[in-house]
Amino acid sequence: VPRWRQQWSGPGTTKRFPETVLARCVKYTEIHPEMRHVDCQSVWDAFKGAFISKHPCNITEEDYQPLMKLGTQTVPCNKILLWSRIKDLAHQFTQVQRDMFTLEDTLLGYLADDLTWCGEFNTSKINYQSCPDWRKDCSNNPVSVFWKTVSRRFAEAACDVVHVMLNGSRSKIFDKNSTFGSVEVHNLQPEKVQTLEAWVIHGGREDSRDLCQDPTIKELESIISKRNIQFSCKNIYRPDKFLQCVKNPEDSSCTSEI
């Protein structure tokens, strides 16, 4: 008789999850020689320990603390790029601008990017059938708590000028319920961070509006200013051109606004 298994509303753990995390870790240490001495088996053991045998709606930041002890990776604190609802462009940007880093350019972010995982209470099994959905089931699930934890630490580490890429095509360009709006904004340290500079990425080719005047951007400016951090905003009217100019800044067409 098959044992009854909790059915959650979200997709199950990504197939071959342990192998994927381990392989990503090894690849990361090869790409980043400054992490060459990291023992990926130990990393996986700590990752696994955060959620295996635990109820997937009862995960806490404390569960991830052993793994977070590895999170002391030294990313230059003044080269941090946050993003909200525009991950692909943010990643394309840091692939070109190699001295800037998104969370997914760090080891822990790289390990978990686009993956889903959860376990089951009192068994050592990984649940490949279903995992809790943040809205329909519970917010304290392994994936949500992981991203909340690493995002908080990433924001806390930032200094000087912090950049954030925002999606100008969305109805809420700045969304208070996003990870950026609910976690990162509130964990920037005013004693370290001088300015938050928002880059609003336009979607339509003919869109010449100043999206920095959008009410949600004004809301972001208000939140940031109340935290004693300066705020600035730039429209990126042509993201394709923007990336091209990051690659080739000497190009004569890159002097005008993009």
């Epitope: 400054e34 001495h37 990291v38 023992d39 990393v43 052993p66 002890k69 002391t72």
Partner: antibody
């Protein structure tokens, strides 16, 4: 085969300076991280500093940070350690070492003795 | 006071097995590879074990390494007189952003 030969050691007064060199051969020097490790008389091994390959990043032990500078010249297959504001506790045999791909010190020189005394 | 803790000495008779422990924390051994070095007085230290349990070519299989949690150990089986030396464990330490060595263990072969 891999050879690492240190030079530049000697007797120096407290507060003085010394520059150690390490001549490398038998491997592609520019590909590898390089380090200095020391052993004080009657004491254990102590890592001093490392320098990365590529655009060099440097790492230092707290005990020498701000006083010692590690550098490399890939064209000359050479590693250096500039030691300033030397103290009696810096007296040691200084080894030059090549790092492997997992951070291990695969190859070591025979060492050069630095004595800091008035 | 070393960051990694080793016993100051260990001994055994010829042919015996000797184990040396190395204790650290999550900022070093916990998440990083452990390396073991053999050092005979007046010579250059020699790499014995890397990546916790891997032997470089030329190192006899009498030497073996293991790691569990925040601790590691080196075992020497079939002890020989030429194994008399100082043995050091080492690992990267995140909180210090550098390598740390154990205090060293002097291995003596008796009789």
């Amino acid at each position: 085969q891999v050879q690492l030969v240190e030079s530049g050691g000697g007797l120096v007064k407290p507060g003085g300076s010394l520059r150690l060199s390490c001549a490398a051969s038998g491997f592609t020097f520019s590909d590898d991280y390089m380090s200095w490790i020391r052993q004080a008389p009657g004491k254990g091994l102590e890592w001093v500093a490392s320098v990365s390959n590529g655009r060099p990043t440097t790492y230092y032990a707290d005990s020498v940070r701000g006083r010692f500078t590690i550098s490399r010249d890939n064209a000359k297959n050479s590693l250096y350690l500039q030691m300033n504001s030397l103290r009696a506790e810096d007296t040691a045999v200084y080894y030059c070492a090549r790092e492997g791909w997992s951070g291990e010190f695969t190859d070591w020189g025979q060492g050069t003795l630095v004595t800091v005394s008035s | 006071q070393s960051v990694l803790t080793q016993p100051p000495s260990a001994s055994g008779t010829s042919g015996q097995r000797v184990t040396i422990s190395c204790s650290g924390s999550s900022s070093n051994i916990g998440f990083h590879f452990v390396y073991w070095y053999q050092h005979l007085p007046g010579t250059a230290p020699k790499l014995l074990i890397y990546k916790n349990n891997q032997r470089p070519s030329g190192v006899p299989d009498r030497f073996s390494g293991s790691k569990s949690g925040n601790s590691a150990s080196l075992a020497i089986s079939g002890l020989r007189s030429e194994d008399e030396a100082d043995y050091y464990c080492a690992a990267w330490d995140d909180s210090l952003s550098g390598y740390v060595f154990g205090s060293g263990t002097k291995v003596t072969v008796l009789g």
